[in-house]
Each structure stands twice: as C-alpha cells, then as structure tokens.
Interface confidence: low
C-alpha cells in the first residue's frame, strides 16, 4: 500500500487503522498522515533507529503506548498534531535525544506531566496550542533549556508557576494568549516575566477575576494581582501545584476509587487522579510492580491487585503509602518479598498474600507493620519462618498460615510457642515433616517435640530459605536481624558477625580503642551500631570502612576527648550521630567533614568551650544539633556560632554560654554579636595546640613560670594541661 | 506543613487533673519544639513550657514548675500536657504550638478549652 | 520575667486606613519580637518574626520595625480580614511572654 523511495517511506491517505508493519530498517523519514490510526504500540517502530522525520498527524490517535519511540535515536522532527490524543504519557521521548521539532497541537491534552519531555533535551519547537490543556506540572519544561519556540495558545490554563519558564533563555517565540488565565497574586510573576520580554507572549490577557477581564497581563501592576486573605494566609505562598489527572481507558473513576478490574491491563496505569484513596486491579494480568508505581498516591487507603500474575516486585513497589489500610496480593505468583517491600506501610491492617508461590520470609519482612490485623500466607511455600518475623505486629489478631509445607524442626519451635501464647492462626496450619509429625498442628505440638538432628544452630539452613547465615556469635544474642552482644566485657568486636545483621548492639562493654578491623565490609545490612556506654578514646581511622549503610551510631558515653573526621570514614549514610556525654572540649572546623547525610548529631554533655568556625558547614542535611550540657566560653572565637545558629535556624535546643560571667548562661544564639569578645585575657580557643607558651613565660612540662615579667594581666595561651602556675612578683590588682 | 490537632473540650473538678493531647498531622514534629500556650477568657496569651520530642527533656515556665508535665509519644507524633492541682483560674483555652525555635510559635493546634467547675 | 507592654490597647480604624500598634520590652530583647494576629474563636497566626520577617503567606501590608525595647507593627492599608487582636511576643528569653494585645475594630 505505501510507497518507498530511497529512505522515505509514504503510507499517507490509505485509511489506516494501525501502523503497517514491515518498515524498512534504514528508513529516514516516515509518512502516516492522513490515516485512521487509534493507537500507536510499543512494537509499531520497533528497530527504526535511523528514523529522522515521522509524521503522525491528522489521523484518530488517542493512546501512545510508553517506549512506543524508544528505539528512535535519531528521530529530529515528530508530528502528532490533529489526533484525540487526552493522555500525555510521562518518558515517551526518553529515547529520543535528537528530536528537535515537536508538534502536538489540535489535540485534546488536558495536562502536562512533570516528567513529559524527559529525554528530549534538544527540542527547539513545541507545539501544544489548541489543546485542552488547564495544567502543567511543574518542571515539566524544565530540561527544554534550547526551546525557541512554544505555543500554548488555546488551552484552558488558569495558572502556571514561575518555575516552569525561568531557564529558557533562546525562547523567541511565545503564545500564550486564548487561555484562562486567573490574575491572582500566583500569577503576578508572569506580568514581570512578560514586561522582560517585549516580543514574546502578545496578547496574554487576563480572563479573571472579573474587574482585570481582557485586560493584557504585561499592563497589569504587580499591585493588583491580589490573592483573598484566606488564600493568602495560606502557608504555601505558591500556586497551588496542579496534578495530571485522568482516569485511564476503559477503567471507571468516581468518589476518589479506580475500577480497573477485568480490564486485560498488562501493567500499572501511570497518571491517576493523586487523590484517589483505593485502586481495584484485581483479575487483571499485571507481571510486574515496578518501583514507585504508587508513590503518588499519598492518599491511597486501599489497593486490590488479586488475581494478577505479578511475580516480580520493586523494593519500593509500596513506597509512600503510609496511609494504605489494605493490602491484597492473593491470587498471584510471587516467590520471595523483596528487602524492604512493606517498609512504611505503617497504616496497614489487612495484607492478604495467601494462594502465592512464597517459599521464603525475611525476618524483617513486616517490621513496620505495628497496626496490621489480619496477615494471610495461607497456601504458599513456606517450609521455615525465622523466630522475630512476626514480632513487631503488635497489633495482630488474625493469621492464616495453612497450607504450607513447613518442617517443623528445632528452627520453627519458636512459632508453636509463639502460637501457644498468642492464639491468632485461626487456620490450623500444620506439619509436612518430619514423618512423625506430619498433619499435626502446628499450635498443638508440645514445643519440645520440635527437634533438629545433629548440631545445627538456630538458623534456618533450609535451601528455601532467603539467607543461608553465620551462626550467632559467643557471648552475643541474635534476634531477628538485631545481634545483642552488649553487658560482656568486650574490647573488640567479635568475629563472624552474620551478614545479615541490621543492628549491631556493642553498648556497655570495655572497648577503649575502636579498631580498624574491616569488620564492617562483611555486614551489608547494617544499619545501626550502638556503642555507648564503652570507655572509647581512640576510634581508628577507617574504623568504620565498609559502613556505607549505616545510618544511625551511638556513641553516648564514652571517653572521646577530640572527634576528627577520619574516625568517620565510611559512613556515608550516615543520619544519626550520637556523641553525647564524652569528654570532647573542641570541635574543630574539619571534624565532620564527609558526614553529608546526617540530620541529628548530639554532642549535649560534654566539656565543648569552642567551635571552630564552618565546623557544622558540611553537614548539609543536619536539622537537628544538640549542643546543651557544655561550658561554652563566648569569646571572639564563638562569634560565628552565634550567627549561625540564628541564620540556620536549626533545632538545637538554645546551647549557652558559661564564660565570660556576663553572658553565663544566655542562649549563644541570643547574644549581641559584638559581645563575643577576647577582652581581658578570654582569649582561650582550645582548638589552638595545647602546648604553646606564652612569650613571657617559661615552660617546662606543665610547669609553667611567669615570675616578675611586670604583669597586669594573665598572659595568653597558658596550656591547658597546666600543673604548676607561678605567678609571684608582678603587678595585678585583680585575681585573673 | 504541620498541622496540630488538639483533643476536645474538658471538664473538671478543681483539685483534679487534665490530659490535653495535640496530635501532628502533614508532618512529623520530633525535632521541632512544641509549645502549650493558654488563654483565659478574655485574657492574654501565657506560655506554659515545651519539649522536643527527640531530646525527650521539657523546658516550663516556672509558674507552672510542678504542676504541668509535658511529654511527647514519637511514636503516634502526638505531645501531651498535664496539669495537675486544677484551679477555677485555670479555666482557659490551651493551645499547643510548634515552630522553628524554642520559643516561636509558627503553627498553632484549634485549642481545648479546660474548664474547672465545682 | 521581661515584660511586654503594647498600645493602645484598642483602636477604631476604617479599612484603607495605615495602622500602628506599638510594643515595649522591659528590658533589651535585640529583635527578638514576633507578632501574632488572633480572630475571636480562632487560634493566633503567626504573622511576623525576628521583628521584621513576614511569615510566608502574610499579606505585604504588614510590617515590623524595631530593636531593642521598641517595636512597631504597621498596616499600610487596613483590610476587612484585618480587625482582629495583635499580639506581641518575646523569643529572647525563657518564659516567652506576650504583651496584653491591641483590639483593632472597625470605626
């Protein structure tokens, strides 16, 4: 039907309803105007990566599939003006860096998603006029630094943010008019933005509020985009961000509830309305959950994806639904529930994974489920659960564990226990083996029936298991991922901690020197290491090598009289740094270099006089610092801090001063900058070396003379570690 | 933004105590300072103390010093405020309050009203 | 405790009207003052601080001068939303204290 010459192929006007196959793999430029093509799928351009012009315009498209374009790396020039296109799928041009021209006008678009042009940085020409456009997310233009020209004229937008058209510096074409603009003080931006501007823009009028109607928004004053108090007082002073809403083809949206059920769907719908609070996907054939899939539903309370044929799960498949109550997951192939799957999903009460494939569960699998109710794995492949998976549901009531193939030997005695005392598993889970215990329940076996043969320790080592592991360590106590080695006179850390540890309890013990073992490079999961309550005084440089995960340290109560930053080499995640009650007197300007990620540092109890300037200026995402409990001396040297806690106006607790007596114990952050001062000998900055002498002194180990030099006033820079202090023969009349 | 919700109007007996909650909602407010202010009818505004909920510690103004305990659950993001040995002039409206520093008060819960009546 | 003294404390005004409601510290509190602004029934708004900063959302229309012991709170051009009780208060010292609060009603 088409025609082709040399590397243009012509298949406008044949009254096509999809996109022939066949194309020829060199083919440049693409001819399919004029047809009646509904749909374009992700195989339609499959291999045409030579493709440079494809035109799609005036034909009956409303549905783009996602990766429909991937494989058009040289695609320049696309037109899909005159179609029914209502969705504007986000990364469509992912793939296609080169395109410069771009035409979707006389379409029916209602909105912009933020991620629409991702990809397609080099375009020059956008054409979305004549759409039915009333948003535009932010920043979906932001990577289209090149535009020159965009036509948005005809649409129904009401607002846009400055953001979306401040980094466009070749625009030299620019419509806008033939909108519903709303002049309110969101939009008094434009009016600037337009003045800036002459030649772009003509013709942007005002359609409301009423008093400004017609009127040119360049001519407005800034003055009279006005907001109502109660918008106003509003604590975003933004416009109000819209959001891409629409409820996808063949499913039915109402009351803030989307009915996909039976729809054939092959994958989450992208771009639903991000109030809605419950998705129905059930009886559909979706795969895969890819990561984020609901992240913007922040409102989502309920969400049915039963009946599928999901097998594989992203980590953060649920990431962000704190609010979700129910869970339903039965009636699919899922083997194993990735690390971290229901992490945050504090708000669930029902989850539903019964009739899967599961063959194992991580023993943190559920931690964050403190409200769940109900929990089903009925009729699975569970041989073994670890002892701890189940106890941070404080809230269960309900658990339905038959119809797995358990073996109950020494690894599962903890469950019958765990039954016996809480009589939640109403299914009456049994037995497979061993031979003599098989069909029995597992609530009604006495516990010491649960045996293993041979010495195998208190791990599962079934192959079915997620993580074949290290035995626990002597003198340590392992529980779920949390090993317990606090209380036993430790002074270094033990060998063979297991892999999967996420807790590393070391607290209490007689550590005096952290050592730089490499201990942590075998612990991938750990996230947190309580040191506290140890006589630490050293921590070795690349003591914390290989801790790139762990986010939270504790190191209360040690001995630490100096922190340095390459004691904390390594700890790139870090968040939480507890120092509290050492014996740290200075920290100094390079102290916590490299700790970019942490948000609470404590160092509340200590002897701290001085920081030395900037020493908190790495920590980009500190938000709280404890700095109470210690003597700081506002001389000249703390000038900074005082400043700085005012500007940065981060949670500190309002540290204060001890020195000099006419600022004891005023707030640092409170005091005059012009009454740090080093007047009258304050001049002490104890991240100065220690062991100067003053010039008119002399010194002999901490032995420090200054007999008869005629002195008014107490030399500066005594050492700190001063024993003897000879003062005799000069002429104070004050006690320094 | 944080949004403070406060529990519901009270009645007491003088000599008894009250358990004012204000729970956060929009946010999580562990690291930031969370305030109870009164107001007695037709009065004037009066801070009665503070805490923030991760250093655990409450700061209180030493008119209220062993009447009012103020505690905070991280958990449930809700602080609390007791105020024990109830007086009719403690009759008022009790406001708890976050913000940026101890003692600025960005955002402000509905308020309880407390009324102490024989 | 540092105390706070506001006046008047009331005042009739017409909307247009450029109102000022000033506050005193009893002792130097640098330009630590924040204004509240409190409809009856209704919890205070934080509406300034640091003696001069708008809070995000404030109409423009108010203001804030002031160091030391003397502070001003300013509105260019009374609006209807605006009649309401202002509240002075000091962040440089534990207790916080609030001055008594100016009553601005409609003349």
């Known amino acids: 039907q088409c025609s082709c010459s040399g590397s243009t192929v012509d298949c406008h006007g044949l009254a096509l309803r999809i996109v022939p196959r066949n194309i020829p793999r060199n083919t440049e430029r693409l001819d399919l105007n004029g047809n009646n093509i509904t749909r374009i799928t992700k195989t339609d351009f499959a291999g045409l990566r030579h493709l440079r012009i494809l035109q799609l315009m005036e034909n009956k498209i409303s549905t783009i599939e996602r990766g429909a374009f991937h494989d058009l790396k040289e695609l320049e020039r696309l037109r899909l003006n005159r179609n029914n296109l209502q969705l504007f799928p986000e990364l469509l041009f992912l793939g296609t860096a080169k395109l410069y021209r771009l035409d979707l006008s006389e379409n029916q678009i209602q909105a912009i998603p933020r991620k629409a042009f991702r990809g397609a940085v080099d375009i020059k020409n956008l054409q979305l006029d004549y759409n039915q456009i009333s948003c535009i997310e932010d920043g979906a233009f932001r990577a289209l630094r090149d535009l020159e020209v965009l036509t948005l004229n005809n649409n129904n937008i009401t607002r846009l943010s400055v953001a979306s058209f401040n980094h466009m510096p070749k625009l030299r074409t620019f419509r806008l008019h033939s909108n519903n603009l709303y002049c309110d003080c969101h939009l008094a931006w434009l009016s600037d933005w337009l003045r800036q501007r002459p030649r772009v823009g003509l013709y942007t009028q005002c359609m409301g509020p009423s008093h400004l109607r017609g009127h040119n928004v360049a001519e407005v004053q800034k003055r009279e985009f006005v907001c109502s108090d109660e918008e106003e007082g509003h604590q975003s002073f933004m416009a109000p961000s819209c959001s891409v809403l629409h409820c996808p083809i063949a499913c039915t949206c109402s009351n803030n509830i989307v009915d996909c059920r039976g729809k054939g769907l092959t994958e989450i719908p992208t771009n639903l309305p991000e109030t809605i609070t419950e998705i129905r996907l059930e009886q559909n054939s979706i795969r895969v959950i890819p990561p984020g899939a609901f992240s913007p539903y922040k409102k989502l309370r309920r969400l049915d994806l039963s009946n599928n044929q999901i097998s594989e799960l992203a980590p953060d498949a649920f990431q962000g639904l704190r609010s979700l109550n129910s869970l339903v997951l039965y009636g699919n192939k899922i083997t194993e529930l990735p690390k971290s799957l229901f992490e945050g999903l504090f708000s669930l009460q029902l989850l539903l994974l019964n009739a899967n494939k599961i063959n194992c569960l991580r023993v943190d699998a559920f931690q964050d489920l403190h409200n769940l109710n109900l929990l089903s794995l009925y009729d699975n492949k569970l041989q073994t659960v670890a002892k701890g998976t189940f106890s941070a549901l404080r809230a269960i009531q309900t658990m339905h564990l038959a119809q797995n193939p358990f073996i109950c030997d020494c690894h599962l005695k903890w469950l019958a226990d765990y039954l016996h005392t809480n009589p939640i598993e109403t299914s009456g889970a049994r037995c497979t083996s061993p031979r003599r215990l098989a069909n029995k329940r597992i609530g009604q076996i006495k516990s010491k029936k649960f045996r293993c043969s041979g010495t195998e320790d208190y791990r599962s080592k079934l192959s079915g298991d997620c993580f074949a592991d290290l035995a626990c360590p002597e003198k340590c106590r392992c529980e779920g991922t949390t090993v317990d080695c606090s209380n036993q006179k430790l002074n270094k850390i033990p060998d063979h901690i297991p892999q999967y540890t996420a807790e590393l309890r070391l607290n209490n013990n007689e550590f005096t020197v952290l050592e730089a073992t490499g201990i942590f490079k075998k612990l991938p999961q750990l996230r947190k290491i309580n040191l506290s309550n140890n006589k630490i005084t050293d921590i070795e440089e690349g003591a914390f090598e290989g801790a790139s995960g762990v986010n939270e340290i504790l190191l209360t109560s040690n001995r630490l009289e100096n922190v340095q930053h390459k004691m904390f080499k390594g700890l790139e995640s870090l968040k939480t740094l507890m120092l509290r009650s050492n014996r740290i007197s200075c920290v100094g300007n390079d102290s916590f270099t490299g700790l970019g990620s942490v948000r609470l540092l404590s160092l509340y109890d200590n002897q701290i006089t001085t920081v030395a300037p900037g020493a908190f200026g790495t920590l980009h995402s500190l938000s709280t610092l404890n700095l109470l409990a210690n003597p700081f001396n506002c001389n000249c040297h703390l000038a900074w801090l005082g400043e700085w806690l005012r500007r940065k106006r981060i949670v500190t607790g309002n540290p204060r001063c001890q020195k000099p007596y006419f600022l004891k114990e005023i707030p640092i952050q409170d005091v005059a900058i012009q009454d740090f001062t080093c007047d009258d000998g304050n001049d002490d900055n104890s991240c100065s070396p220690l062991s100067r002498c003053p010039s008119e002194c002399t010194c002999l180990d901490t032995v420090v003379r200054c007999s008869n030099k005629g002195l008014k006033v107490l030399p500066k820079g005594i050492p700190r570690d001063v024993t003897e202090l000879y003062l005799d023969g000069n002429q104070f009349t004050l006690v320094p | 933004q944080v949004q403070l919700v406060q529990s519901g109007a009270e009645v007491k007996q003088p000599g008894s105590s009250v358990k004012v909650s204000c729970k956060a909602s929009?946010?999580?407010?562990?690291?930031?300072?969370v305030s109870w202010v009164r107001q007695a009818p037709g009065q004037g505004l009066e801070w009665m103390g503070g805490i923030i909920p991760i250093f655990g510690t409450a700061n209180y103004a030493q008119k209220f010093q062993g009447r009012v305990t103020i505690t905070a659950d991280e958990s449930t993001d809700t602080v609390y405020m007791d105020l024990s040995s109830l007086k009719s002039e403690d009759t008022a409206v009790y406001y708890c309050?976050?913000?940026?520093?101890?003692?600025?008060?960005?955002?402000w819960g509905q308020g309880t009203l407390v009324t102490v009546s024989s | 405790d540092i105390q706070m003294t506001q006046s008047p404390s009331s005042l009739s005004a017409s909307i247009g009207d450029r109102v000022t409601i000033t506050c005193r510290a009893s002792q130097n509190i640098n330009a630590y003052l924040n204004w509240y602004q409190q409809k009856p029934g209704k919890a205070p708004k934080f509406l300034i601080y640091?003696?001069?900063n708008l809070q995000s959302g404030v109409p423009s229309r108010f203001s804030g001068s002031g160091s030391g012991t003397d502070f001003t709170l300013t509105i260019s051009s009374l609006q209807p939303e605006d009649f309401a009780i202002y509240y002075c208060q000091q962040s440089y010292r534990s207790p916080p204290t609030f001055g008594g609060g100016t009553t601005v009603e409609i003349k």
């Open positions: 929009g946010g999580s407010f562990r690291s930031y300072t």
């Open positions: 640091a003696a001069s």
């Open positions: 309050a976050t913000g940026s520093g101890w003692y600025t008060f960005d955002y």
